[in-house]
């Protein structure tokens, strides 16, 4: 099966790498613009220079291109707890990330929120916190894992999953209650 090519890919594939086909004259291959620049004017003829201009502040192109405009720099989303790791330059977009001891939770492919890594209080660290994954905790006896926090078995209701982990404690509580009736 031949992969479906868009019009722009079809046009580009006629020319050697690093060049693109002139939009008004398909017998001319123009040199693409370097990263950090954009296409101001197509080359007037074969072997003649493409008119490329540097991106203005607040915009960038990260690869060779024949874009008519540079791309707008991304802004880190403060409401998602994001911080700027490196600022935007003409040839590289802003890099956003999380603070130390935080991890990313992705709401979609391009949107993440920063959350604090779990400290595993009343438990031990099974897997350390990573860029895109919270700490994995193992709880001490008498505690069960709820939303990645170790919670006392005294907070375990019979209907919850914790009953298996907290069974001895629940039986003890039940026994204590029964012994009080004598």
């Amino acid at each position: 099966l031949v992969p479906h090519l868009g019009d722009r890919e079809k046009r580009d594939s006629v020319c050697p790498q690093g060049k693109y086909i002139h939009p008004q004259n398909n017998s001319i291959c123009c040199t693409k613009c370097h990263k950090g620049t954009y296409l101001y004017n197509d080359c007037p003829g074969p072997g003649q220079d493409t008119d490329c201009r540097e991106c203005e502040s607040g915009s960038f192109t990260a690869s060779e291109n024949h874009l008519r405009h540079c791309l707008s720099c991304s802004k880190c989303r403060k409401e998602m707890g994001q911080v700027e790791i490196s600022s935007c330059t003409v040839d590289r977009d802003t890099v956003c990330g999380c603070r130390k001891n935080q991890y990313r939770h992705y709401w979609s492919e391009n949107l993440f929120q920063c959350f604090n890594c779990s400290l595993c209080l009343n438990g031990t660290v099974h897997l350390s916190c990573q860029e895109k994954q919270n700490t994995v905790c193992t709880c001490h006896a008498g505690f069960f894992l709820r939303e990645n926090e170790c919670v006392s078995c005294s907070n375990c209701k019979k209907s919850l999953e914790c009953t298996k982990l907290c069974l001895p404690q629940i039986e003890n509580v039940k026994g204590t209650e029964d012994s009080g009736t004598t």
Epitope: H105, W107, S108, E109, N110, L111, Q113, E147, N148
Partner: nanobody, 120 residues
């Protein structure tokens, strides 16, 4: 076919409370992150709140933080939004939405919306 049906909207006085529900069908509800989005009259869409598939992660817009609570019941395929201390500026159509798994769009599917009017 994915269906998201919101309910619970209505007229409420400032300071009052409402609980919105979203009944989901046509997909495996507990595999998807979900959210609430709103559109005030004559304004653009505003993210209100998101919740991950198992309820461990939540997001709230600054404008609703401390007043609204998102939750879900995966056994009932239902998403909720508890809205307390309502203000006039919360007046909007509230949409339940399924968050995208991949691609540049944040949402894949939306409900028809339910109108919340906060007025004395």
């Amino acid at each position: 076919e994915v269906q998201l049906l919101e309910s619970g909207g209505g007229l409420v006085q400032p300071g009052g409370s409402l609980r919105l529900s979203c009944a989901a069908s046509g997909f495996t509800f507990d595999k998807y992150q979900m959210g609430w989005v709103r559109q005030a009259p004559g304004k653009g869409l505003e993210w209100v709140s998101f919740i991950d598939s198992n309820g461990h992660h939540t997001y709230y817009a600054d404008s609703v933080k401390g007043r609204f609570t998102i939750s879900r019941d995966n056994s009932k395929n239902t998403l909720y939004l508890q809205m307390n201390s309502l203000r006039a500026e919360d007046t909007a159509v509230y949409y339940c939405a399924q968050l995208s798994v991949q691609g540049s769009n944040l949402f894949d599917y939306w409900g028809q919306g339910t109108l919340v009017t906060v007025s004395s």
